[in-house]
């Protein structure tokens, strides 16, 4: 059997668990006595279409309720275990009163007020986090949703929606609570050099300028001590002592999948024969370690026009 719960002195409306898409009439019974539940609205507990309404609910209403869907060729019976709880005395909402947890990871996120579609409610829905009314402009109530702008871990907690159900000219309060957690999007990884390829040889023209980019990615939200740099014959460019060869400071970039990447460009103003004998290392390092791609320069072969 399925379970439903509510709070004492609040409205509770439940659906027959066997209902599916059926349009056939539904009858409700107290399963322990087999006594039929009436459809007259003057009763505190009554049936309306496929729904069983407790207006308002009381602790003694707790029990198992049976619903029977009568169709021409088959009767389907469903059972619903209804528990009505006293209101918790403190702000700590016990687990048994919690609806499913919502997980957010985007900059903007929404929380849906659980079960609200069963009720005849009117806006606005009031929202509380850990029992405090939400008044910051980042929190926006719209229809049955709470929208949170610029979500951070501090937004995690228990969110309660409170709304009014109207029936027969009487208003009843309904509250429902669910947890909201923020999933981590960031991660840090061992550096991956995306350019130049491993053991690459680059063609250059003597006397002409050349530039080589060293690019590496480190994860998402993971700049801590991440760097890319060039070494020439295992010496950092600044200490190599060749003014023609300069390194452009690593700049931040994002890859197509939002990875944190850095690029450093090695510039040679005029390539000499000597440069062809040097070893150029593109290094990427972070907290997890270091990776190196070595490249060499080769004289570009003149195009044979014969």
């Amino acid at each position: 059997s399925k379970s439903s719960w509510g709070l004492e002195n609040e409205a509770l409306i439940v659906r027959c668990p066997q209902r599916g898409r059926s349009t056939y009439p539904v009858e409700w019974y107290y399963s322990d006595t087999n006594e039929s539940i009436p459809t007259q609205k003057r009763n505190r507990i009554f049936v309306s279409r496929d729904r069983l309404k407790f207006l308002p609910a009381r602790v003694e209403d707790s029990g198992i309720y049976a619903c029977v869907i009568r169709s021409p060729n088959l009767n389907k019976t469903g059972y619903l275990n209804v528990t009505i709880h006293k209101k918790p005395p403190s702000c700590n909402i016990p687990d048994y009163l919690m609806y499913s947890t919502v997980r957010g990871s985007d900059k903007n996120f929404k929380i849906t007020c659980p079960t609200i579609d069963l009720y005849n409610w009117t806006a606005p829905v009031q929202w509380f986090k850990n029992c405090k009314a939400l008044q910051e402009p980042r929190f926006r109530a719209h229809r049955s949703y709470l929208f949170i702008d610029n979500v951070t871990h501090d937004d995690e907690g228990d969110y309660t929606c409170q709304f009014t159900h109207a029936e027969n000219g009487t208003n009843y309060i309904v509250t429902a609570t669910r947890s909201f957690t923020v999933e981590e999007k960031g991660f840090s990884m061992f550096p991956v050099i995306t350019n130049p390829p491993y053991n690459h040889t680059m063609e250059v023209e003597i006397g002409k300028p050349a530039s080589i980019a060293c690019s590496a990615c480190f994860g998402k939200g993971s700049h801590f001590l991440a760097d890319v740099l060039w070494q020439i014959n295992k010496t950092v460019v600044g200490n190599f002592g060749e003014a023609r060869i300069q390194e452009e400071e690593g700049r931040n970039e994002s890859s197509s999948n939002d990875m944190d990447c850095l690029t450093s460009v090695l510039r040679i103003t005029g390539v000499t024969e000597k440069d062809l004998s040097l070893e150029y290392d593109c290094l990427a390092l972070n907290l997890h370690g270091m990776i190196r791609h070595t490249i060499r320069l080769r004289r570009k072969q003149p195009i044979d026009h014969r």
Partner: antibody, heavy 116, light 107 residues
């Protein structure tokens, strides 16, 4: 919510060693590195080194080379910092902190008192 | 090692005041600078990362700026809960180094 919970306060004799633990929860342990920072009474913050939870790669500040060892236990999502040959000037609060774009989550700190 | 020089080392201010703390690096550190707030007996808390990105749950009265070697933390309107010690941290090159701290006290 990411949490780093450190072991309790320690009182140690000069020349001995101390091992402080830092248990991580609420995030993917292997996605990050854990740094260790210490603070002597009434003083500023001092970097000690880090360990990669991903592969165990370590890097120690020059000052602590040869005296500090950082290890990890992936099965319990815990990192350890052991400092040996303790002297009175090692009396400090030792913090672990998760390193991403910054030191975004910190442990509550462990007070280590070195006294004869 | 890169030296981080923080100034002033302490300052007295009143609630509502605009407060500025500066941090100077002994060499260029690109954007790899964070600011932390520490209250007595507590662990430091990340305020700002990568020069100007506000940490989780940090009020918008805190802001960061600067580049290269000179960086600034600004509190636009000091609140009672802001009385604390503030540290900058560079993590452009190893080892990362903290500034000496700025203690913000009630005038």
């Amino acid at each position: 919510q990411v949490q780093l919970v450190q072991s309790g306060a320690e009182v140690k004799k000069p020349g001995s060693s101390v091992k402080v633990s830092c248990k991580a929860s609420g995030g993917t342990f292997s996605n990050y590195a854990i740094s260790w920072v210490r603070q002597a009474p009434g003083q500023g913050l001092e970097w000690m080194g880090w360990i990669s939870a991903y592969n165990g790669n370590t890097n120690y500040a020059q000052k602590f080379q040869g005296r500090v060892t950082m290890t990890r236990d992936t099965s319990t999502s815990t990192v350890y910092m052991e400092l040996s040959s303790l002297r009175s000037e090692d009396t400090a609060v030792y913090y672990c902190a998760r390193s991403t774009n910054a030191l975004d989550y910190w442990g509550q700190g462990t007070l280590v008192t070195v006294s004869s | 090692d890169i030296q981080m020089t923080q100034s002033p080392s302490s300052l007295s201010a009143s609630v509502g005041d605009r407060v500025t703390i500066t941090c100077r690096a002994s060499q260029g550190i690109r954007s790899n600078l964070d600011w932390y707030q520490q209250k007595p007996g507590k662990a430091p808390k990340l305020l700002i990362s990568i020069v100007s990105n506000l940490g989780s749950g940090v009020p918008s009265r805190f802001s960061g700026s600067g580049s290269g070697t000179d960086f600034t933390l600004t509190i636009s309107s000091l609140q009672p809960e802001d009385f604390a010690t503030y540290y900058c941290l560079q993590h452009n090159s190893n080892p990362p180094t903290f500034g000496g701290g700025t203690k913000v006290e009630i005038k």
